[in-house]
């Protein structure tokens, strides 16, 4: 089945805005809103924001989990409001971060 | 929005310890890490160390390890930064901010800890 | 402890572009990412670029950054009177497992 296309007019959500991109705000507007974690060095980054272009989330929101990076997607006004992305597997310690729990 | 509120002024004599603490209101306190940065009078910024409050452990600079501790209390989503044997060295204003490992996006207003004698 | 090194100072007339350096390692900005903050006279540092070269909402794209091997850069154009500030680069050095800072760049506007 085709990816669906998307609308001339396409509709924006409401997104809960936490985290690098978002300056001052705590929200944005966008096509789709995401959730987001990856491990870095044994360092879990959490992000929460929106995709303003169609094209910009389509292939970010279809990746699927890996060990190091999750993204979770959706549409609706503030739906990633109470989504914590969680990785596929338990995480493994990296060499050397001794001093962070991984889950 | 995220904002990050300190603790106010202190004044230590050497050889005492400072704790500093770091309010995070708006978003979500224990997923996100927590850098504790600090800049002595006409000098550039140091880092001393970090927390991941949703795992209760610290990473911390060299420079400050067996003198620094980092804690966080997710009940009252604060996080602290206690400095012990205090010297001259240490007057500085400390910062804490949200730490997303590609930048430090949220910052506090920071915290003048003064040591003398 | 600086790590990283920028010039201590740069200059530039209003509307002049100015670039401001930073160096690091294989262990720093070599295999992360780098970001830069902005500091005024009195006030906490304001996160200006991450991710390398990634504003966040709000910062004007007259400032840009960008990474190569070992070193990074922050550009700024149109330079305005109020740009007069501190400006540091910042990366996660693997070796340390630590945040490391550059000593900071004195930017002037002139005139």
């Known amino acids: 089945m085709e990816d669906e296309k998307p609308k001339v007019n396409p509709k924006l959500y409401m997104c809960v805005c936490e985290g690098l991109s978002c300056g001052n705000e705590d929200h944005c507007e966008g096509q789709q809103c995401f959730s987001s974690l990856s491990i870095n060095d044994g360092f879990h980054v959490y992000q929460k924001g929106c995709f303003q272009v169609y094209e910009q989330g389509k292939m970010t929101c279809k990746t699927p989990p890996s060990p190091g990076q999750a993204v979770e997607c959706c549409q609706g006004d503030w739906c990633n409001r109470n989504i914590t992305a969680q990785l596929p597997t338990k995480g493994k310690s990296f060499p050397g971060t001794q001093n962070f729990h991984l889950e | 929005q995220v904002q990050l509120v300190q603790s106010g002024a202190e004044v230590k004599k050497p050889g005492s310890s400072v704790k500093v603490s770091c309010k995070a209101s708006?978003?979500?306190?224990?997923?996100?890490?927590i850098s504790w940065v600090r800049q002595a009078p006409g000098q550039g910024l140091e880092w001393m160390g970090l927390i991941q409050p949703r795992f209760g452990t610290a990473n911390y600079a060299q420079k400050f390890q067996g003198r620094v501790t980092i804690t966080a209390d997710e009940s009252t989503s604060t996080a602290y930064m206690e400095l012990s044997s205090l010297r001259s060295e240490d007057t500085a204003v400390y910062y804490c901010?949200?730490?997303?490992?590609?930048?430090?996006?949220?910052w506090g207003q920071g915290t003048l800890v003064t040591v003398s004698s | 402890d600086i790590v990283l090194t920028q010039p201590p100072s740069v200059s530039g007339a209003p509307g002049q572009r100015v670039t401001i350096s930073c160096s690091g390692s294989?262990?720093?900005?070599?295999?992360?990412?780098v970001s830069w903050y902005q500091q005024l006279p009195g006030t906490a540092p304001k996160l200006l670029i991450y991710?390398?070269?990634k504003r966040p909402s709000g910062v004007p794209d007259r400032f840009s950054g960008s990474k190569s091997g070992t070193s990074a850069s922050l550009a700024i154009t149109g330079l305005q009177a109020e740009d007069e500030a501190d400006y540091y680069c910042?990366?996660?050095?693997?070796?340390?497992?630590?945040?490391?800072f550059g000593g900071g760049t004195k930017l002037t506007v002139l005139g």
């Open positions: 901010a949200r730490d997303y490992y590609g930048g430090m996006a949220y």
């Open positions: 991710d390398n070269s």
């Open positions: 708006g978003g979500t306190f224990s997923t996100h890490a």
């Open positions: 294989s262990s720093n900005i070599g295999q992360n990412y």
């Open positions: 910042s990366s996660w050095d693997l070796l340390s497992k630590s945040r490391v």
